[in-house]
């Protein structure tokens, strides 16, 4: 029988390389049975995880899984770092593994990368 516990499917040591100045969606895959849990995002600061209260979030529902999304409009250099989502479910707090954003600010470099450079650096093409 399938477990009806809430599960958060962020892979251990997952990471995203992204560009400052782009929109970005950080997804927390959430599996639940009946009632959708209350999910929040936080950003790691040393040993504590600071809740992101003022940020735009949304739910995306798919057939077998839902995604709680943290939106960046746009990504900023100080968004660099590790994030975690957590769910409150029947008085239990379930925490995900952390996922790390590596933010490159091409505008602080002397020149923005060309399309050819982008093609040779596919890690930048995160979507």
């Amino acid at each position: 029988k399938e477990s009806c516990d809430v599960q958060l499917y962020i892979k251990r040591q997952s990471e995203h390389s992204i560009l400052a100045g782009d929109p970005f969606e950080l997804e927390c895959p959430v599996k639940y049975c009946a009632n959708r849990p209350h999910v929040t995002w936080c950003k790691l600061n040393g040993t504590t995880c600071v809740k992101l209260e003022d940020r735009q979030t949304s739910w995306k529902e798919e057939k077998n899984i839902s995604f709680f999304i943290l939106h960046f409009e746009p990504v900023l250099p100080n968004d660099n770092g590790s994030y975690r989502c957590s769910a409150n479910f029947q008085s239990n707090l379930i925490e995900s593994h952390s996922t790390t954003l590596y933010v490159t600010d091409v505008k602080s470099a002397s020149e923005r990368p060309s399309k050819d450079e982008m093609a040779s650096r596919p890690w930048l093409l995160y979507r």
Partner: antibody, heavy 125, light 108 residues
Amino acid sequence: EVQLVQSGGGLVHPGGSLRLSCAGSGFTFSSYAMHWVRQAPGKGLEWVSVIGTGVATYYADSVKGRFTISRDNAKNSLFLHMNSLRAEDMAVYYCARGFYYGSGTNYYNRGMDVWGQGTTVTVSS
Amino acid sequence: EIVLTQSPGTLSLSPGERATLSCRASQSVSSSYLAWYQQKPGQAPRLLIYGASSRATGIPDRFSGSGSGTDFTLTISRLEPEDFAVYYCQQYGSSPYTFGQGTKLEIK
């Protein structure tokens, strides 16, 4: 004067292709995200696509896999390449300026604050 | 996606009256990312309000926006003849960047 001037559009058969262009002037084009929004005859506004100041692109589900947004910052130009056009794609298409990102924490997001004049795409056999 | 529902669909008022337009979201929208636009026939939309309550450049102070979470309001304190148009709300913090279906403000 800050403005967006659109070109392209016209009549195309179902399954056909079209490219829309949008030229920006009076502002630092490369520092702004850019959007396409459309409006079918007698209907409301529908967001189509956005491109950030880097490489990120996002699309409405209705056009994903058929439309491609791109930009040429050297020419202050935004493009929408539309393939496999359908009757439901028939609309006035607008380009619009989105968030500003300079560098560091130099940014703001005021929605779509400058719009092009619109260009009509007619899909008919 | 975040669905925005505007009400009423049509609002019939006279010049000089006060107009109150509502926009309700299916999920919470950060007030930083809620805008209102005005559109007249044959014209492109024009940004009126961004960040739920900030007036865009050149917009008269009779236009004001308020609200947070899932409920937002555009108020036109004293209608001028040029204010009769269609008004759209939009959330722009979450892709897809959805618009409401519009409220038509017509002369009574």
